[in-house]
């Protein structure tokens, strides 16, 4: 018979034959042959593989480093990685939660809508037209543009969401 060019789901092609993939939680020890099945071994303690695979090494569980404010939210199994979270009152810097911050800052162009608490991180909002923020802050709201008119001045440079307007003297009309 012709050697296969593609294999079924949960199989892989090697040496012109289809071998079974190892199930999640197990790693490949040896490929199948004409006479033997694929040989797999369970991952060791603190290791995992989360897919049907042909990996020869399991992945190490993530370490939740207490020096970075991390603790274990969900212990890993042979089929799942450990999930880290931050100590109470701290917030993850990313979805992967690789480190913790007290709270995040809102970038220039954004103002603080709600200051962080022990439960929720800083909530930022974009500065609308007429307002700006030129700093990174965890407490400052967007500031209104300076009103040149109230100072008897005119706008020399328009404001943006990151910069205030620049006011200047009115042109005096010559008689």
């Amino acid at each position: 018979p012709e050697p296969p060019t593609a294999c079924r789901e949960k199989q892989y092609l090697i040496n012109s034959q289809c071998c079974s993939l190892c199930q999640p939680g197990q790693k490949l020890v040896s490929d199948c042959t004409e006479f033997t099945e694929t040989e797999c071994l369970p991952c060791g303690e603190s290791e995992f593989l989360d897919t049907w695979n042909r990996e020869t090494h399991c992945h190490q569980h993530k370490y939740c480093d207490p020096n970075l404010g991390l603790r274990v939210q969900q212990k890993g199994t042979s089929e799942t990685d450990t999930i880290c979270t931050c100590e109470e009152g701290w917030h993850c810097t990313s979805e992967a939660c690789e480190s913790c911050v007290l709270h995040r800052s809102c970038s220039p162009g954004f103002g603080v809508k709600q200051i962080a608490t022990g439960v929720s991180d800083t909530i930022c909002e974009p500065c609308p037209v007429g307002f700006f923020s030129n700093v990174s802050s965890a407490f400052e709201k967007c500031h209104p543009w300076t009103s040149c008119e109230t100072k008897d001045l005119v706008v020399q440079q328009a404001g943006t969401n990151k910069t205030d307007v620049v006011c200047g003297p009115q042109d005096r009309l010559r008689a």
């Epitope: 970075l68 404010g69 480190s99 709270h103 995040r104 800052s105 965890a138």
Partner: nanobody, 116 residues
């Protein structure tokens, strides 16, 4: 790497005053927003006060408004918290925090106990 060292805590009677200091070393201090945060025994972290990098803007939690005052001296790389009219509920460990507020830049704190 930035090191933050809080000092000035102690035992004080209700109605008394204390001035906390936070000395920063190993990193630029000027231009960075700074916070005072406290943790009462058995409670979570409470954000008490903040000051902008320029020193022009400040924030105070409602619980300390009118009693606490935050300031900074960039020439001394030091942040201050003047605490007046102290109450029993101000008893806590006080920490300072510097942008970007990472856990590994956290100081040891200074304990303030308000008791008669």
């Amino acid at each position: 790497e930035v090191q933050l060292l809080e000092s000035g805590g102690g035992l004080v009677q209700p109605g008394g005053s204390l001035r906390l200091s936070c000395a920063a070393s190993g990193s630029t201090f000027a231009g960075y927003e700074m916070w005072w945060v406290r943790q009462a025994p058995g409670k979570g972290l409470e954000r008490v006060s903040a000051i902008s990098g320029s020193g022009g803007s400040t924030y105070y939690a409602d619980s300390v408004k009118g009693r606490f005052s935050i300031s900074r001296d960039d020439s001394k790389n030091t942040l201050y918290l003047q605490m007046n009219s102290l109450r029993a509920e101000d008893t806590a460990v006080y920490y300072c925090a510097k942008e970007p507020y990472s856990f590994d830049h956290w100081g040891q704190g200074t304990l303030v106990t308000v008791s008669s």
